[in-house]
Interface confidence: low
Amino acid sequence: KVILDKYYFLCGQPLHFIPRKQLCDGELDCPLGEDEEHCVKSFPEGPAVAVRLSKDRSTLQVLDSATGNWFSACFDNFTEALAETACRQMGYSSKPTFRAVEIGPDQDLDVVEITENSQELRMRNSSGPCLSGSLVSLHCLACGKSLKTPRVVGVEEASVDSWPWQVSIQYDKQHVCGGSILDPHWVLTAAHCFRKHTDVFNWKVRAGSDKLGSFPSLAVAKIIIIEFNPMYPKDNDIALMKLQFPLTFSGTVRPICLPFFDEELTPATPLWIIGWGFTKQNGGKMSDILLQASVQVIDSTRCNADDAYQGEVTEKMMCAGIPEGGVDTCQGDSGGPLMYQSDQWHVVGIVSWGYGCGGPSTPGVYTKVSAYLNWIYNVWKAEL
């Protein structure tokens, strides 16, 4: 049975086996086509989601689709039902929390009262002044909190207590990539992890431990990527994995927060990377223990310089490392998070690509998660 499962796939009606390598090859080998059903699927970027959260205290903003202008949500008459609608628009299914926060001196958007229409937030037509003088601070999911805060700089062994959202993504029980838990159903990783194996069956997710082999595997229901853009082959290196059964959160299994839409990190901002990747470039072996390292944002202009990536780093990517090299992600770390800590931990990047590992002028290049928030929300909404 184990050998059969490893090398063959069972078609139904009529029952017969086909070689597993014929799964997800674009050809219908089973009469009913089930060999092409459970494959990595692409999902277009889709329309703009009409709600978003700002880094200014996670305040809610709503889009007026008629004008294309964004407005800040006034706390007047804001209800739990409206909070749930806002979060559902972003694809969250969990119970949100919200509170009033004072309108700050730097408030640059008009503040309007919010109502609901067809399960979408709208601006109240006859909206007067925001009498409460407060905005809506909204949290769709409790995220980004760990039991332990990393304190050191440089590279060292990590504890799952510090990074409870880190998962190992495995094919045929072999670690291939890292990933991050975003909510009970969803794991964020890199699309390039699935280039070689596009069938969903043999992919598993392992969560809740900092040691590679020591935790139970979770079945994957779906793997979703963005349509491949041949003009920018390194772009869109992002994937979402939907788990077959929702995770039960604990001290060692928790979600990380998505970044805010306006999370612009300046050069030298401290960030963290984690992974079980290769510990020596061009060889070595996968680390059995989760490793963590502190890095910093590296200016895209510097990263695109003639002695570096010569323009290959697009606006949907970001560079991170340390200026003289030596601390970087490497093979096997792909898909893992590049993290920023404010009040909570946010996954601002996904380990994507780079030339070598730890070179001084060629730092790690990461998928910029804030550039794909719309896509993530649209995927989640479609799967609600």
């Epitope: 700089v153 440089g154 300046t266 030298a268 502190s294 890095v295 910093q296 003289e324």
Partner: antibody
Amino acid sequence: EVQLLESGGGLVQPGGSLRLSCAASGFTFGAYVMHWVRQAPGKGLEWVSSISGGSTYYADSVKGRFTISRDNSKNTLYLQMNSLRAEDTAVYYCARHPVRGVIGAGWFDPWGQGTLVTVSS
Amino acid sequence: DIQMTQSPSSLSASVGDRVTITCRASQNISRWLAWYQQKPGKAPKLLIYAASSLQSGVPSRFSGSGSGTDFTLTISSLQPEDFATYYCQQAISFPLTFGGGTKVEIK
């Protein structure tokens, strides 16, 4: 060879100003965090200030009086010192951060030869 | 701020002696400690970083150890050129702070 050369030190009266410069060579200056460290005569080492990208950091003893800056096109680090006091008398060293970790931490290597600032009436 | 306490403040030793200098941090700094050597009229020189990593070009008779709050610099066999003042420095957070120094003199 990596080299750092400080200049601009001298005798100044209390309340006066001075601008120190540190010329760097032998490395990509703009990619590195840079520091000023001082040493009063016969005393130990005291960190003064650091600069990285757009971030600047200062010791409490100089905050509001000293300003660190850099000109990457000229490979030069500066320390503008205003409202000088007698206790600012020291040899001022410019040093590079070897950047073995994130900003907010690090050691100093190499160091310049130092420039003496004397604040006295 | 993290305080760094070095001891002894001075010591007398002979060529060939094994010399140990200790440094204590007021809070846990993991392994983020550096050691410097300074000779009169000269700039300091980095000897050890990350508590125990020897800076390139530094003789192997120098070694560092420790983690957390307690650290040690050891010179296994003191040479004439090692008579100098030694400083420890915490490298984990601003403000970066140094120990008061240990002057190693000829006995």
